[in-house]
């Protein structure tokens, strides 16, 4: 039985032009993480593979940086980056766990610093 749970930063906001860290954490399972996919609407942003390391999708290379840890840093944010992001953990032997983060990119400088993973 799959016992694990994914904790995420939940709903977060950031300023246009700024950066944000997307972070998920898998807990309550002894399963081994074999790969983490970071996805946005059926599009792959990046992969962190336990054996092969990081792969950033070519279309995001300029604006996405690996880490910290299994997280993902989005840079030079635009309003178009607003939306849902998914961390998909491939684990052995449990299978797949999915976490969801909603990012809102704000035009103004009143972006709430609601997430502890926010980069100032």
């Amino acid at each position: 039985m799959m016992t694990g749970t994914i904790e995420t930063t939940g709903n977060i906001s950031a300023e246009k032009g700024g950066s944000i860290i997307l972070q998920c954490h898998l807990s309550s399972t002894t399963a081994q993480v074999t790969q983490v996919n970071w996805e946005q609407q059926d599009q792959l942003l990046a992969i962190c593979n336990a054996d092969l390391g990081w792969h950033i999708s070519p279309s995001f290379k300029d604006r996405v940086a690996p880490g910290p840890g299994l997280g993902l840093t989005l840079q030079s944010l635009t309003v178009n980056d607003t939306g849902e992001y998914f961390c998909i953990y491939h684990t052995y032997p449990d299978g797949t766990y999915t976490g969801r983060i909603f990012l809102e990119v704000l035009e103004s400088s009143v972006a709430e610093h609601g997430a502890r993973f926010q980069i100032p």
């Epitope: 074999t34 790969q35 992969i47 593979n49 999708s57 052995y92 032997p93 299978g95």
Partner: antibody, heavy 119, light 107 residues
Amino acid sequence: EVQLQQSGPELVKTGASVKISCKASGYAFTGYYIHWVKQSHGKSLEWIGHITCYNGATNYNQNFKGKATFTVDTSSSTAYMQFNSLTSEDSAVYYCARSNYRPWYFDVWGAGTTVTVSS
Amino acid sequence: DIVMTQSHKFMSTSVGDRVSITCKASQDVSTDVAWYQQRPGQSPKLLIYSASYRYTGVPDRFTGSGSGTDFTFTINNVQAEDLAVYYCQQHYSTPYTFGGGTKLEIK
């Protein structure tokens, strides 16, 4: 909905080649792995190999090395398998299937492509 | 290559019954075994992976167990739509191999 749509049936001559396609939809294609599986008429399933969709790395069953070639086109989320030097033994249904990176179980399958080799 | 042996090519059961299908690996595959259902004219469908993990959306009347070399797939309260061929597969090492299949017939 996660789907793998395969190309239609093929009737080919002995010694010819065939290229089968598998178009993915409903998920981030490059984050997963596409496997190819052979099922001869009324028989069991045989794993041909797999391709890593984001970098094109391949892993072939020794029994199919030199016979099968896998490629991907990430722009169209499509995987391809080319089968060369066809003989009657290659007449079968060929499936593409998706997997995670370990454990390697196949969670989504295409409908299959029937290849008939005739002399 | 690891050989997966399903000793029964055919099994007959009745609606409402319980049926168990066995699969034996030629060497230790830990718990790296999946079970698939293939209905007539259809592609295989994943039911169980890692020996005992039920795939998303699969009814809980389907269960899997075993480790090492001996594995069992059980259907409780068999339904008419369970008429199919069931395959085990080892996902322990390449080349990944399948059992010969067990055809479940409904009396």
